[in-house]
């Protein structure tokens, strides 16, 4: 009994990849049986030479080579972008049209959007080094050389994650040249080499007076803003803190700062920021309309000392 | 025709948090990077974040790290900013905007408003 | 991170009169391969920006010849030959060389 076409195996995603050639399925039911045609951004092709498409006698379409681009349909504009094609089943109680299916060609741009960097980090410490891969399609991969061969991860010490490759805890073996690598069907691209140096850890005695050190935060007051740093400059406050105990066993003292949440809610990480003087200094890179909390630790070398009481202060939303 | 629609501006308070969405429509968004970019009161243009056609890799300047995310569902053509710890700064006009590789943002939606005030 | 400063802040010119716009980079935006990524937008008030110029001097589909964009390293020209009504807005710069992208000011060209 005669029927009217209906798509069957509709034609899918491809992605074209040299040398070729690329395959497009269509298989349509009805009686008759229906001819296919194939259409590339809905235009019928022409399937004859120097045409690259070539129809096999079970409808699906060979690709030999890529088509080449014509004007961007659709809004597309990257040259991945090859068409959409799609197929046409008739016979003479109808027509069926098949779902479109994407042509793209593999690509893989050159320019990495984050080099890694050279550094130097200390034994036993955490470091990362950054890679931001090219634009690619399909979307890169990353893998991290070291020396000219594929670094070997180790769960727990090293972890790639969005490109960026961390290392949990320094060793003396980890120093060396490191280079980031993107591949995809396209191919591969190799980032700058960076140099890693691993310096070992100062030594240090811990000075059991510094553990004595009592600080009292007295003060924290909201500066003035610097008419010379423009419209909207950022605020800074001064402290002032008195310490007692051993006669000046600290070299440094650093603010510690943090806004404030909510009552019971989850408290922010504190920000560190290393200050300029021994009883007094300022500290800058605040935000307007936040609640903040401050406390001042005194520190010699790798040491540190025990944390000041806690003082609030509110700023205004904008001076 | 490329067409990128933000939603979910609003008023948040200091500390607060909001995500915002861009439905993409008009190409194959998953073949595409993508961008936020926000327009302070002042008129001044601020890149946000951007990410990878695939979702894998994102960038952010050190102003929003740690508080903004950028992520796609390519299934749904849609681009997210989930924002948190948000302060006053962040007052601004927050627009989408597709990436042709990572060379130049080529359309732009018309943006949805953010007002970060207590 | 590099820095874009425009030049000038406001640029009042007549119709059919010639303006150019200076956008200048803290640091080079010629990368490692010898690309440079400094592309030009227009915004009108209330709507989005529009590219103008991408990767220094080609043209966006769309966009007249009277506009050019020219430079190399960390120094950039929009140039618009003969300046129509449409025109008038803000202009701004933009760098995606480095990471941080980082925007100019803005220059607002306005009717004398």
């Known amino acids: 009994q005669d029927s009217p076409p209906q798509i069957l195996v509709h034609p899918q995603d491809q992605l074209f990849q040299g040398p070729g050639p690329a395959r497009m399925s269509c298989q349509a039911s009805g009686q008759p049986p229906p001819t296919i045609r194939w259409l590339l951004n809905g235009q019928p092709l022409s399937m004859v030479p120097p045409d690259p498409h070539h129809l096999l006698p079970d409808g699906t379409l060979l690709l030999l080579q890529p088509p080449a681009r014509g004007h961007a349909h659709d809004g597309q504009a990257l040259s991945t972008d090859l068409g959409v094609y799609t197929c046409e089943a008739s016979n003479r109680l109808g027509t069926a049209v098949s779902r479109g299916a994407r042509l793209s060609v593999a690509v893989l741009r050159e320019d990495f959007q984050i080099q890694p960097r050279d550094m130097v980090a200390v034994v036993g410490e955490q470091f990362t080094l950054e890679c931001g891969p090219p634009w690619g399609h399909p979307e890169p991969t990353v893998s991290w050389w070291k020396d000219g061969k594929p670094l070997a991860l180790q769960p727990g010490r090293h972890t790639v994650s969005g490109g960026s490759l961390l290392m949990a805890r320094a060793e003396k073996s980890d120093e060396g040249t490191y280079m980031c690598v993107a591949t995809n069907s396209a191919g591969h691209r190799e980032s700058r080499a960076a140099r890693v140096s691993i310096q070992e850890p100062q030594d240090y005695t811990e000075p059991v007076e510094l553990l004595a050190v009592r600080i009292q935060l007295e003060n924290v007051t909201l500066l003035n803003p610097d008419p010379a740093e423009g419209p909207k400059p950022r605020p800074a406050v001064w402290l002032s803190w008195k310490v007692s105990g051993p006669a000046a066993p600290a070299q440094s003292y650093t603010a510690l700062f943090r806004t404030q949440t909510a009552p019971g809610g989850q408290g922010a990480p504190w920000a560190e920021e290393l200050l300029a003087g021994w009883q007094s200094a300022e500290l800058g890179g605040l935000h307007w309309g936040q609640d903040y909390e401050f406390k001042v630790r005194p520190s010699s070398g790798r040491a540190r000392g025990p944390d000041s009481n806690v003082l609030l202060l509110r700023l205004p939303e904008k001076v | 025709e490329v067409q990128l629609v933000e939603s979910g501006g609003g008023l948040v308070k200091p500390g607060g948090s909001l995500k915002l969405s861009c439905a993409a429509s008009?190409?194959?968004?998953?073949?595409?990077?993508m961008s936020w970019v926000r327009q302070t009161p002042e008129k001044r243009l601020e890149w946000v974040a951007t990410i990878s056609n695939g979702g894998t890799y994102t960038y952010y300047p050190d102003s929003v790290k740690g508080r903004f995310t950028i992520s796609r569902d390519n299934a749904e053509n849609t681009l997210y900013l989930q924002m948190s710890s948000l302060r006053s700064e962040d007052t601004a006009m927050y627009f989408c905007?597709?990436?042709?590789?990572?060379?130049?943002?080529?359309?732009w939606g018309h943006g949805t408003t953010l007002t970060v005030s207590s | 991170d590099a820095v874009m400063t425009q030049t000038p802040l406001s640029l009042p010119v007549s119709l059919g009169d010639q303006a150019s716009i200076s956008c200048r980079s803290s640091?080079?935006?010629?990368?490692?391969?010898?690309?440079?990524?400094l592309n030009w937008y227009f915004q009108k008030p209330g709507q989005s920006p529009q590219l103008l110029i991408y990767r220094v001097s080609n043209r966006f589909s769309g966009v007249l010849d009277r506009f050019s964009g020219s430079g190399s390293g960390t120094d950039f020209t929009l140039k618009i030959s003969r300046v129509e009504a449409e025109d008038f807005g803000v202009y701004f710069c933009?760098?995606?060389?480095?990471?941080?992208?980082?925007f100019g000011g803005g220059t607002k060209l306005e009717i004398k």
């Open positions: 008009g190409f194959t968004f998953s073949t595409y990077a």
């Open positions: 905007a597709r990436l042709i590789y990572y060379d130049y943002l080529d359309y």
């Open positions: 933009l760098q995606v060389t480095h990471v941080p992208w980082t």
């Open positions: 640091q080079s935006l010629e990368n490692s391969n010898g690309n440079t990524y």
